[in-house]
């Protein structure tokens, strides 16, 4: 922490301006009034403070606002945002998308994924739900940031907003997030025709259950292999060879390259070798002919 000293009279600060860049750390600490700093935050970003000096300014604001900064200050943080930790941000209440945009711009090119994720979380909490304007802002200023939200937060997305989400916005989403988003997407796109529906639903299919994947296999969709590889393992395992062949169409030829990778590997192990042979790809590892499969888990459940 910065050592406390008295401010020399000639160094007293009456406004935030460029002269402050010549102040030493201890002079900034002693001479800058926190309330003045907060009132003139909009000037800070235009002044080329060093990172050390920014540390002092942050310390000032932390003392003034121990419960978290007000949005009037947050909006004008500028490069001071780079000094914030997720713990700092967790104390904020942010409702303005202008504030979000300003801080997302500042964070670009810096390793701040944890801070950005926390900031977005605070915006969603502050606004009450993940509305269309928020989604539009995220997709425009922070592609991929949607996936930084927890499944709980994502559950506040109304289905009507799903159409604003682009495929690249979902690239970093995990299975739990897609589990939340998929039913909303299904609802949002339910009135579309077969091929149009598939194009729209495809980025969300990592959250689809087996019955929906089976239904798609009856619709001549020709699912590409990249999408197939992102399906839930649990959704793929019950599919028959015939269903996978219908689902993938010409893309089924790509299964050979993915033979050793999940979920293809696990799926192969559950198929009869005779059936796998019909794919004409030399896939190996299926259940040999004449073998009987006993599902012991069923017996255990009954006893």
């Amino acid at each position: 922490d910065v050592e406390r000293t008295t401010c020399p009279p000639e160094k007293e600060v009456h406004e935030i301006d460029e002269s402050l860049i010549f102040y030493k750390k201890r002079e900034l600490e002693a001479c800058v009034d926190a309330a003045l700093l907060a009132a003139q935050m909009d000037r800070v970003d235009a002044i080329p403070f060093t990172y050390e000096q920014l540390d002092v300014l942050k310390h000032k604001l932390d003392e003034l606002y121990p419960q978290g900064y007000p949005e009037s200050v947050i909006r004008h943080l500028g490069h001071l945002f780079l000094k914030m930790s997720p713990e700092d941000i967790r104390k904020w209440n942010v409702t303005s998308l202008e504030t979000l945009k300003a801080l997302l711009k500042v964070s670009k090119g810096h390793e701040m994924s944890a801070q950005v994720a926390t900031l977005i979380d605070r915006v969603v909490v502050g606004r009450g739900q993940l509305d269309k304007d928020t989604v539009d802002t995220l997709t425009a200023f922070c592609p991929g940031c949607l996936c930084s939200l927890s499944p709980e937060r994502l559950s506040s997305v109304p289905p009507s907003v799903i159409g604003a989400v682009r495929p690249q916005d979902l690239d970093t989403c995990g299975p739990r997030q897609l589990d939340v988003l998929y039913p909303k997407a299904r609802l949002a796109f339910q009135n579309m025709s077969g091929s149009e529906y598939f194009v729209k639903i495809r980025p969300f299919l990592g959250g689809a259950p087996t019955e929906d994947v089976k239904a798609l296999s009856q619709q001549n969709v020709s699912m590409d292999l990249a999408t197939f590889m992102k399906l839930r393992r649990e959704a793929v395992l019950p599919l028959t060879v015939a269903e996978v062949q219908k689902l993938l169409g010409p893309h089924v030829e790509g299964l050979k390259v993915e033979e050793q990778h999940s979920p293809v590997r696990d799926w192969i192990l559950k198929q009869r070798q005779d059936d796998l042979d019909t794919l004409g790809l030399g896939l190996q590892g299926g259940i040999p002919n004449g073998y009987l499969i006993l599902d012991l888990s069923v017996r255990e459940a009954l006893s």
Partner: antibody, heavy 121, light 107 residues
Framework: EVQLVQSGAEVKKPGASVKVSCKAS????????MHWVRQAPGQGLEWMGN????????YYNERFRSRVTMTVDKSTSTAYMELSSLRSEDTAVYYC??????????????WGQGTTVTVSS | DIQMTQSPSSLSASVGDRVTITCKAS??????IAWYQQKPGKAPKLLIH???ELQPGVPSRFSGSGSGTDFTFTISSLQPEDIATYYC?????????FGGGTKVEIK
């Protein structure tokens, strides 16, 4: 050694059909799909389609869909490509090609010697 | 379908020259491109796959680079036996497509 041996040159009249064969040896025929590629005189290579040799399911280039039929005879490890309603623009060398599944959907590492089909009245 | 635009369609260079051919894909194909050499009356011969992986027995003067949509094939020092037409092939999609070809001649 992998070999794809194609049938001999053909001369056909416009409106007729031609059936080109490709006999595979040196590998398990039912483990690799067979592809067909054609090349008109002085032109580039054009992918026509492929066929699953195990159960005969073909996929065609949209351009040829209405006129091409690809089949296989597993017992002789032979693939066939039949093109109907021939016109002069179908004059070309027709190749069968086997993919190597090293990455993605596979690139062609073995080719037949080519079959010249001439369509002329 | 993915279109492959190859350029130039023909080129003339001297023995020992560095020759560069480009292929542009109409959409992202990662690194799934192969390059073939075809001599008159012969079937195409695979030189390179997965953008830059040289086939066994192919001279090291042949090389490839790129990813996404823009790819380059290079002959570092042109030899008389390299006179041929060269084609790119995308296999990122099961419906394969070739570039239009580049005819390489000696000046």
């Amino acid at each position: 050694e992998v070999q794809l041996v194609q049938s001999g040159a053909e001369v056909k009249k416009p409106g007729a059909s031609v059936k080109v064969s490709c006999k595979a040896s040196g590998y398990t025929f039912t483990n690799y799909w067979m592809h067909w590629v054609r090349q008109a005189p002085g032109q580039g290579l054009e992918w026509m389609g492929n066929i699953n040799p195990s159960q005969g399911g073909p996929y065609y280039n949209e351009r040829f869909r209405s006129r091409v039929t690809m089949t296989v005879d597993k017992s002789t490890s032979t693939a066939y490509m039949e093109l109907s309603s021939l016109r002069s623009e179908d004059t070309a060398v027709y190749y069968c090609a086997r993919p190597y599944y090293g990455s993605s959907y596979g690139y062609f590492d073995y080719w037949g010697q080519g079959t010249t089909v001439t369509v002329s009245s | 379908d993915i279109q492959m635009t190859q350029s130039p369609s023909s080129l003339s260079a001297s023995v020992g020259d560095r020759v560069t051919i480009t292929c542009k894909a109409s959409q992202d194909i990662n690194k799934y491109i192969a390059w073939y050499q075809q001599k008159p009356g012969k079937a195409p011969k695979l030189l390179i796959h997965y953008t830059s992986e040289l086939q066994p027995g192919v001279p090291s003067r042949f090389s490839g680079s790129g990813s996404g949509t823009d790819f380059t094939f290079t002959i570092s020092s042109l030899q008389p036996e390299d006179i041929a037409t060269y084609y790119c092939l995308q296999y990122a999609n099961p419906l394969r497509t070739f570039g239009g070809g580049t005819k390489v001649e000696i000046k």
